[in-house]
Interface confidence: low
């Protein structure tokens, strides 16, 4: 006869490991007992359990409560055992020794491999700001046994770098994603993908990119200078910009205080019925935590009694 077993048994951390050992004998042969031992190189043999055809299963104290026979029905020639709730320390070489009648003793070895699936973590880098050079967007770390694979899934252009730290029974892999921040990256997902033989499917963690920026400011409302005449109602200037975080707006007048009756409503400057005292240089100041921008315009209120046309200067400055 001969013993049937596996070269390698692979199990995920916390699962039960079936250690197979089946005697394929000739007609009339019987199995008397099966002894299981752990036989890691250089450490001698450590008994797990003894399976006796008459007296049943005896488990050594070190494995009390963790070694069982597979559930019935059982074949008397099957010496397989279950190792409950496998932990990393269980990884190693195991031997089954089978005593048969009348053929004598047989032995076989197998290796138990315990997979430790990773629990990945994604850490965003420092705040991203337009105008920065190559900057860390996020790092992703996963530790497991064997070492997990860490990659990135995104349509954002960037570069990756990985490093690995080996521990006694596992390895930690960290991958960093660097990019040159631009406002077009706002809202784009950056996904860390972790692959590992102990996972049924890849684990994915998504981070949404946020890039601080502030667009140039401009002022609308003076496109038709002929509308800015004495007595006109509803005249207004609107300051245009865009930013992340959303910017705040402030209005001042360069050549004096804002005239009475002029209303500031965020990005909009509203005028009462126009008089010549509303002529002047108005400045929109846009700012967020990232930057600030100014745009100024010259308002020249026309007197319908006068024929001379006036010019409008538009100046934008940072």
């Amino acid at each position: 006869g001969e013993l049937e077993t596996s070269d390698v048994v692979t199990v995920v951390l916390g699962q039960d490991a079936k250690l197979p050992c089946f005697y394929r004998g000739d007609s009339g042969e019987q199995v008397g007992q099966v002894a299981w031992a752990r036989v890691d190189a250089g450490e001698g043999a450590q008994e797990l359990a003894l399976l006796h055809s008459k007296y049943g299963l005896h488990v050594s104290p070190a494995y009390e409560g963790r070694v069982e026979q597979p559930p019935p029905p059982r074949n008397p020639l099957d010496g397989s055992v279950l190792l409950r709730n496998a932990v990393q320390a269980d990884e190693g070489e195991y031997e089954c020794r089978v005593s048969t009648f009348p053929a004598g003793s047989f032995q076989a070895r197998l290796r138990l491999r315990v997979l430790v699936p990773p629990l990945p973590s994604l850490n965003p880098g420092p705040a991203l700001e337009e105008g920065q050079g190559l900057t860390l967007a996020a790092s992703c770390t996963a530790e497991g046994s064997p070492a997990p694979s860490v990659t990135w899934d995104t349509e954002v252009k960037g570069t990756t770098s990985s490093r690995s730290f080996k521990h006694s029974r596992s390895a930690a892999v960290t991958s960093e994603f660097h990019l040159v921040p631009s406002r077009s990256m706002n809202g784009q997902p950056l996904t860390c993908v972790v692959s590992h033989p102990g996972l049924l499917q890849d684990q994915r963690i998504t981070h949404i990119l946020h890039v601080s920026f502030l667009a140039e400011a401009s002022v609308r409302g003076l496109e038709d200078q002929n509308l800015w005449h004495i007595g006109r109602e509803g005249a207004m200037l609107k300051c245009l910009s865009e930013g992340q975080p959303p910017p705040s707006y402030n209005w001042t007048r360069l050549d004096g205080p804002l005239p009475s009756g002029v209303r500031v409503d965020g990005d909009t400057l509203g005028f009462p019925p126009l008089t010549t005292e509303h002529s002047g240089i108005y400045v929109c100041h846009v700012s967020n935590e990232f930057s600030s921008r100014d745009s100024q315009v010259t308002v020249d209120v026309l007197d319908p009694q006068e024929d001379s046309g006036k010019q409008v200067d538009l100046v934008s400055a940072s």
Partner: antibody, heavy 117, light 106 residues
Amino acid sequence: QVQLQESGPGLVKPSETLSLTCTVSGGSITNYGVHWIRQPPGKGLEWLGVIWSGGSTDYNPSLKSRVTISVDTSKNQFSLKLSSVTAADTAVYYCARSGKWYYFDYWGQGTLVTVSS
Amino acid sequence: DIQMTQSPSSLSASVGDRVTITCRASQSIYSNLAWYQQKPGKAPKLLVYAATNLASGVPSRFSGSGSGTDFTLTISSLQPEDFATYYCQHFWGTPTFGGGTKVEIK
């Protein structure tokens, strides 16, 4: 073929919370975002927000204080909640799928929600 | 937010006509623009993404062009099933849609 199906009450009272569900079938939503977009009767389209299969969300800043999107990946179901509704929230609400960029290759058929007392 | 201005808001055309719809962004959106077709009572259907790429299953009479702020959707030879409303949409940051262009039968 990927299919999206919106469901939920067609009538919501003012000041209450609108709740809709989008069920995705016929394909995996891993790597994809599920978006909510609405269209008031006779008007244009407005993007409300997105949730990714990993749970990350991104909302329209103009509605951020009122919108919550969540996911039950085991059921491939995505939920929209819009609080403190008014008549201006009356619209056809669509869910749609996108890849990593926010353009929408698959849409649900839409569900009309009317806000009225 | 970035504003998307579509023109014209409506147009009348005949089968076989060449139709052009334009969309202007209030600032550069690079090539981050999509076009959709919507028929009454139906959801929008993706026609073009990334300004110039035809979506799967869309007839070749549709084409998109442009980058930066100015974009165009062209139907080279209008077919009966093309009478619908067309929307542009940018996907640069918070998405916004154009106001729509209704293509009607002349």
